[in-house]
């Protein structure tokens, strides 16, 4: 495949990545699938600088990111190491709260109204952010 050198229409370029910001809500798994179908992934936050960029674009709205612990350990969807990576949890979070009454705890991470992170029930219909890296091989065939 060819290398992607510029962002698709309606995506925002920042630091060699492209970002797409939803304006509707989906459950985490559906948001994750949406990004994958766009040859992208839910946003993976690797620095304070990237955190500020995303926060600026989403505003004070609950928004899914590509971090979950649905199988036990916290994992970023692109394989970035959680343990050594950037974290921006709200105080007292993550708390795997069971009191919501929906069954199970809270396994998916989202940006809260102040940008810091919280874990929540993955079925909640929050907005989401997709990310894809420039210079990575595209799934599309090259133009001849």
């Amino acid at each position: 495949g060819s290398e992607r050198t510029c962002c698709p229409v309606n995506w925002v370029e920042h630091e060699r990545s492209c970002y797409w910001f939803s304006r509707s809500g989906k459950a985490w798994a559906d948001a994750d699938n949406y990004c994958r179908l766009e040859d992208a992934h839910l946003v993976v936050v690797t620095s304070w600088e990237e955190q500020k960029f995303v926060q600026h674009h989403i505003g004070p709205v609950n928004t899914w990111m590509g971090l979950h612990d649905q199988n036990g350990p916290w994992k970023w969807v692109d394989g970035t190491d959680y343990e050594t990576g950037f974290k921006n949890w709200r105080p007292e979070q993550p708390d795997d709260w069971y009191g919501h009454g929906l069954g199970g705890g809270e396994d998916c991470a989202h940006f809260t109204d102040d940008g810091r992170w919280n874990d929540d029930v993955c079925q909640r219909p929050y907005r989401w952010v997709c990310e894809t890296e420039l210079d990575k091989a595209s799934q599309e065939p090259p133009l001849l």
Epitope: E83, Y98, G104, G105
Partner: antibody
């Protein structure tokens, strides 16, 4: 590599107290809820208590409520179980385990309550 | 509280056999259930989480299925190292509850 190591078990008389510890390593301890599970000799597994990552939420089995206290020290990557008013039926191997889905377990520590 | 029952409580099988263990919940727990293997004198080990997802490093001969109130653990071809006791666990709501266990021994 995730590791959980329990300690503090031993022989104690009925009515006595014991404090179990679980030393955690290989993961960001404060990001995970933790649990105590026990197994009486020759019996099945019994969930005892859980605590969320920042100690906001704490849960106990009815069989230990009011007698056992779960706590954690995230600075020391350690989980604790303070056991008071011990009874013969508390005799068991006590395991610590990570998260609600119990993905990693320690090797266990034996608590024997006998006169 | 949610009660978990397991059947059978024990079974005898031979290497190569297909083994199925059933776990039932007293109320619906979606897919919030795990399966654990325990050998004598050892800590339990997670095999399956979320009813059907295989734990990393666990052989593919183990599989889980089910949702709601009825769940199964299947070992497609029993190996010598699989003789052990198997427990299900619901972590849908507190108090968490284990099934009573199924002991798989040599026929």
């Amino acid at each position: 590599e995730v590791q959980l190591v329990e300690s503090g078990g031993g022989l104690v008389k009925p009515g006595g107290s014991l404090r179990l510890s679980c030393a955690a390593s290989g993961f960001t301890f404060s990001s995970y809820s933790m649990n105590w599970v026990r197994q009486a000799p020759g019996k099945g597994l019994e969930w005892v208590s859980s605590i969320s990552g920042s100690s906001t939420y704490i849960y106990y089995a009815d069989s230990v409520k009011g007698r056992f206290t779960i706590s954690r020290d995230n600075a020391k990557n350690s989980l604790y179980l303070q056991m008071n008013s011990l009874r013969a039926e508390d005799t068991a191997v006590y395991y610590c385990a990570r998260v609600a889905a119990f993905d990693y377990w320690g090797q266990g520590t034996l608590v024997t309550v006998s006169s | 509280d949610i009660q978990m029952t397991q059947s059978p409580s024990s079974l005898s099988a031979s290497v190569g056999d297909r083994v199925t263990i059933t776990c039932r919940a007293s109320q619906g727990i979606r897919d919030i259930l795990g399966w654990y293997q325990q050998k004598p004198g050892k800590a339990p080990k997670r095999l399956i989480y979320a009813a059907s997802s295989l734990q990393n490093g666990v052989p593919s001969r183990f599989s889980g299925s089910g949702s709601g109130t009825e769940f199964t653990l299947t070992i497609s071809s029993l190996q010598p190292e699989d003789f052990a006791t198997y427990y299900c666990l619901q972590y849908h709501s507190y108090p968490f509850t284990f099934g009573p266990g199924t002991k798989v021994d040599v026929k």
